[in-house]
C-alpha cells in the first residue's frame, strides 16, 4: 500500500494527500481544550482507472459497470487517531483517543 | 454506524449500497476456481453535508475548506472478505481469504 503526498505547490492532478492544519479555535470549537490545532491532512485529486485503488473490489465494480456507479473517488485509505482533552457536554472533562482524525494515506475507493 | 441499502427500484438519491453480483466467468478470469460469482455490492449516490459521514475528519475538512477539497464521496465504509480458490500463476492452486471484496456498508468519506 502506498499513496502520493503533495503540497500547495504540486502540479499533481491525481489522487494525493495534501497538508491541512485544522484549527479548532478558528472554528469556535471552545469545548476542545487540547490540542488547539493539529495536522489533519486531506485527500484530493482524480482517480483514473486502477490508479491507487485500495481494494480489488473497486476494479471489479469498474469491470461490472453497474448503473449509477460513479467510479472511484479520492478518499482516505489509512487514518490514525489523535489524543484530545475536551468537555463532553456534561460538565466533564475527558481525555480520549479520537479515531480517524488524521489522514495518513489517500487512495481511490 | 449505519448505511442505507437500496436496490434497482429505489428512488433514493443519497449515498446508498446497491446489490451487485460479480461474475468472474463473464470477465474471463479463468484462474479463479471458486467462487464463480459472488455478491460484491457497490456504493452510489450523493453525499450532502454531514449525511452518513464516517469520520469526524470529513466534517473538519469541510469546515476548513482547503483548496481542491471536493467534499465527501459515497464510498465503502465497511467491507468483508471472501474465500477464494485460485491459480496463483505459478502452477499452484491456493485457497485464500481475500480482503475487502464485499461492501457491507456505504458512507460519505
Amino acid at each position: 500500500d502506498f499513496g502520493l503526498d503533495c503540497d500547495e505547490h504540486s502540479t499533481e492532478s491525481r489522487c494525493c494527500r495534501y497538508p491541512l492544519t485544522v484549527d479548532f479555535e478558528a472554528f469556535g470549537w471552545d469545548w476542545i481544550i487540547a490540542p488547539k490545532r493539529y495536522k489533519a491532512n486531506y485527500c484530493s485529486g482524480e482517480c483514473e482507472f486502477v490508479f491507487l485503488q485500495k481494494y480489488p473490489h473497486t476494479h471489479l465494480v469498474h469491470q461490472a459497470n453497474p448503473r449509477g456507479s460513479a467510479g472511484p473517488c479520492c478518499t482516505p485509505t489509512k487514518m490514525s487517531p489523535i489524543n484530545m482533552l475536551y468537555f463532553n457536554g456534561k460538565e466533564q472533562i475527558i481525555y480520549g483517543k479520537i479515531p480517524a482524525m488524521v489522514v495518513d494515506r489517500c487512495g481511490c475507493s | 454506524d449505519f448505511g442505507l441499502d437500496c436496490d434497482e427500484h429505489s428512488t433514493e438519491s443519497r449515498c446508498c449500497r446497491y446489490p451487485l453480483t460479480v461474475d468472474f466467468e463473464a470477465f474471463g478470469w479463468d484462474w479463479i476456481i471458486a467462487p464463480k460469482r459472488y455478491k460484491a455490492n457497490y456504493c452510489s449516490g450523493e453525499c450532502e453535508f454531514v449525511f452518513l459521514q464516517k469520520y469526524p475528519h470529513t466534517h473538519l475538512v469541510h469546515q476548513a475548506n482547503p483548496r481542491g477539497s471536493a467534499g465527501p464521496c459515497c464510498t465503502p465504509t465497511k467491507m468483508s472478505p471472501i474465500n477464494m480458490l485460485y491459480f496463483n500463476g505459478k502452477e499452484q492452486i491456493i485457497y485464500g481469504k481475500i480482503p475487502a471484496m464485499v461492501v457491507d456498508r456505504c458512507g460519505c468519506s
Epitope: - | E25, G28, D30, A34, K36, E91, I94
Partner: antibody, heavy 116, light 107 residues
C-alpha cells in the same frame, strides 16, 4: 444431472503412453475447472492434476509433473489426461472430477494398468 | 506438502450410533477442508466442503466442523447406507492432499 464418463484406460507397458478422456454433461463444462484423481488398488486417493475453466492454467504434483499433461476441449465438453513414460506405480483407477471449492462430482473411473 | 492424518483408520459401529472421524493437517489450512464418502467399487462422493458446508443432496445427519489444523466429520445417527470409507482432503494449497481414509464397518 451432472455426468462424467472416463475412457481410454487399459493395459500398457512401462515407458508407454496412454490418453484418458472424460466426457462431461449436465453442466456448463466451460465454466468449471476440472481435476484428475487416481486410486491405486486397495489404496487411498491421490490428486493428479487440475486445469482451469478456460484451459489456461494447470497444476500437477511432483509425482507426475513432466510426464502427464492435462488439457480440455470446451467445444467437445471433454477433459483429457495424456500420460507418458508410464511406471508400474501409475497403476490405478483414474477419476475425473468437477472442481469447485471441492471436487463436487466424480466419474466412475477408468483402470490403467502398467505392467510388462 | 501438507500432510493430512485421519483417525481412526477404521471403526466398528452400529446403526443409530453417533460417529466421529477426525482429520488433522500438518499446518493451518483455514477452512479449506473437504470430506468424501467412498463405497467399494464406486467413485468418491462429496459430503462436506469448506469444513462445514453440506453438499447439496447430502443428508443432514452429516456435519463437519473445525478450522486451522483440526477437523471433524460427524454422522449423528449412522444408517445402513453409511458404511463406507471416508476421506478428508485439503484444498488450501497444491499439491492437493487426502487423508489415508477411515473405514466405517458394521459392528
Amino acid at each position: 444431472e451432472v455426468q462424467l464418463l472416463e475412457s481410454g484406460g487399459g493395459l500398457v507397458q512401462p515407458g508407454g503412453s496412454l490418453r484418458l478422456s472424460c466426457a462431461a454433461s449436465g453442466f456448463t463444462f466451460s465454466s468449471y475447472a476440472m481435476s484428475w484423481v487416481r486410486q491405486a488398488p486397495g489404496k487411498g486417493l491421490e490428486w493428479v492434476s487440475t486445469i482451469s475453466s478456460g484451459g489456461s492454467y494447470t497444476s500437477y504434483p511432483d509425482s507426475v509433473k513432466g510426464r502427464f499433461t492435462i488439457s480440455r476441449d470446451n467445444s467437445k465438453n471433454t477433459l483429457y489426461l495424456q500420460m507418458n513414460s508410464l511406471r508400474a506405480e501409475d497403476t490405478a483407477v483414474y477419476y475425473c472430477a468437477k472442481q469447485d471449492y471441492a471436487m463436487n462430482y466424480w466419474g466412475q473411473g477408468t483402470l490403467v494398468t502398467v505392467s510388462s | 506438502d501438507i500432510q493430512m492424518t485421519q483417525s481412526p483408520s477404521s471403526l466398528s459401529a452400529s446403526v443409530g450410533d453417533r460417529v466421529t472421524i477426525t482429520c488433522r493437517a500438518s499446518q493451518s489450512i483455514s477452512t479449506a477442508l473437504n470430506w468424501y464418502q467412498q463405497k467399494p467399487g464406486k467413485a468418491p462422493k462429496l459430503l462436506i466442503y469448506s469444513a462445514s458446508s453440506l453438499q447439496s443432496g447430502v443428508p443432514s445427519r452429516f456435519s463437519g466442523s473445525g478450522s486451522g489444523t483440526d477437523f471433524t466429520l460427524t454422522i449423528s445417527s449412522l444408517q445402513p447406507e453409511d458404511f463406507a470409507t471416508y476421506y478428508c482432503q485439503q484444498s488450501y494449497s497444491t499439491p492437493l492432499t487426502f487423508g489415508g481414509g477411515t473405514k466405517v464397518e458394521i459392528k
